[in-house]
């Protein structure tokens, strides 16, 4: 089995995504996410569909899951705002918008992360970053520390194939390799950072890792523009 | 044992740019945060520039920022500062700094900075 | 942005004996505070870091404490090496602001 972090990637540079958000319930990390802006989280709906009765809260400025950083701080949720046509069936429309009880405390380990507005297709071939504290190989251990994986880009029509995600792959989504590196369960809602921008969201399907044949599916955010500056508004 | 040297200060016109380096040894150079910080002719230290271990994130305070860059160079072990558009309020002693425990651990002894006409 | 208010700025005692220099922060910094001792020529020496952690190699007469907003530091048995400006920082949030310093001359 693929061994190494995410799934065959490596620790990641200490507070050197700024925009790195933990999802947690109850104390403990559920999903990723990516800070937006000063009070919003970008994440995936399908994280908090089993939170109904636990405390959702946001890590912010975290390198170690447990260790004391000065510029780790959890937030409490005010509002969470999942997209209004996600459903617990399918992939499409995985986002969720997390509102914080309060504006971030910005900093070098505390920063937005700007995102993609133009709906346009990411080069097949383009190196893109994904981060996350998702589980590091197949027997499910999870990392402490921030892990990351530099994937390609996968052109749709291959990833639409019937022998990957046979037509599933939408306009509003997008693919990237998952050859031995991959995205990984514990990943989903992290972003897909390509040349400093915010293109993607880790879905949170359920989806066997670091197979090829079953590449990374990720949420366009450029696709989603309308919808995220209405909530934010 | 742990030594930081910095070099590049000078005086220097109003308006005028200036790159410092600091010169790193006796440990892993690559492993650390690294930070500037100056100490102004009232005494008064202040934090300037801040870079991770690898270069992926830098830090600037709004006093600096768009003014002053810090970089790295790990196969050379230094640290860098460009400053441009000098103003006579940026007359110091800057110093290069090491980060462990996020406090500011290992100081150089600094290099002065004059910003006259 | 948080700032420090560091008291008093100047300050003179005797061979042997104790001084204390206080930090106030603007609002809660977590107990992240560092005290450094500056003498002219050289950079600053980290002693303490997190509010009460002694560097190696410093030796025991020199302690911090404190929380939430107010922290102290102190030398005791004040030695004639011990003639530096004295400076606290406040690195929560890895946002680093420092007290205005303190001047320490032995009578």
């Known amino acids: 089995p693929p061994r190494g972090r995410i799934l065959g990637g490596r620790e990641a540079e200490a507070h050197a995504r700024p925009y790195m958000a933990s999802v947690q319930l109850n104390g403990a990390h559920l999903c990723g996410g990516v800070l937006v802006a000063e009070q919003w989280v970008l994440s995936a709906a399908h994280c908090l569909e089993d939170a109904a009765d636990g405390k959702v809260q946001v890590l912010l400025g975290a390198h170690s899951l447990s260790q004391p950083e000065p510029s780790k701080r959890l937030y409490d949720v005010l509002r969470a705002v999942p997209h209004p046509d996600s459903q617990p069936d399918t992939i499409d429309h995985d986002l969720l918008l997390l509102q914080l009880s309060e504006k971030a405390t910005l900093g070098p380990a505390v920063r937005p992360l700007p995102w993609q507005r133009v709906d346009r297709d990411v080069a097949p071939g383009t190196l893109c970053d994904v981060a996350g504290w998702g589980i590091v190989n197949h027997a499910g251990r999870r990392p402490d520390s921030l892990q990351h994986v530099l994937l390609p880009v996968l052109d749709r029509a291959t990833c639409n194939r019937r022998t990957h995600h046979d037509g599933a792959i939408t306009e509003r989504l997008m693919c990237a390799e998952s050859n031995r590196r991959d995205s990984c369960k514990g990943d989903s809602g992290g972003p897909l950072v390509c040349g400093g921008v915010l293109e993607g969201v880790v879905t949170s399907g359920s989806r066997v890792c670091g197979n090829r044949k079953k590449p990374g599916i990720y949420t366009r955010v450029a696709s989603y523009a309308a919808w995220i500056d209405s909530v934010l508004a | 044992e742990v030594k930081l040297v910095e070099s590049g200060g000078g005086l220097v016109q109003p308006g005028g740019s200036l790159k410092l380096s600091c010169a790193a040894s006796?440990?892993?150079?690559?492993?650390?945060?690294m930070s500037w910080v100056r100490q102004t002719p009232e005494k008064r230290l202040e934090w300037v520039a801040y870079?991770?271990?690898?270069?992926?994130?830098?830090y600037y305070p709004d006093t600096v920022k768009g003014q002053f860059t810090i970089s790295r160079d790990n196969a050379k072990n230094t640290l860098y500062l460009q400053m441009s558009s000098l103003k006579s309020e940026d007359t110091a002693i800057y110093y290069c700094?090491?980060?462990?425990?996020?406090?500011?651990?290992?100081w150089g002894q600094g290099t002065s900075v004059t910003v006259s006409s | 942005d948080i700032q420090m208010t560091q008291s008093p700025s100047s300050l003179s005692a005797s061979l042997g004996g104790k001084v204390t220099i206080t930090c106030k922060a603007s609002?809660?910094?977590?107990?992240?505070i560092a005290w450094y001792q500056h003498k002219p020529g050289k950079g600053p020496r980290l002693l303490i870091h997190?509010?009460?952690t002694l560097q190696p190699g410093i030796p025991s007469r020199f302690s911090g404490s404190g929380s939430g907003r107010d922290y102290s530091f102190s030398i005791s048995n004040l030695e004639p090496e011990d003639i530096a400006t004295y400076y606290c920082?406040?690195?929560?949030?890895?946002?680093?602001?420092f007290g205005g310093g303190t001047k320490l001359e032995i009578k």
């Open positions: 609002q809660d910094i977590n107990k992240y």
């Open positions: 006796g440990f892993t150079f690559s492993n650390y945060i």
């Open positions: 920082l406040k690195y929560d949030n890895l946002l680093y602001t």
């Open positions: 870079i991770t271990n690898g270069g992926g994130a830098t």
């Open positions: 997190y509010t009460s």
């Open positions: 700094a090491r980060h462990d425990f996020y406090a500011l651990d290992f």
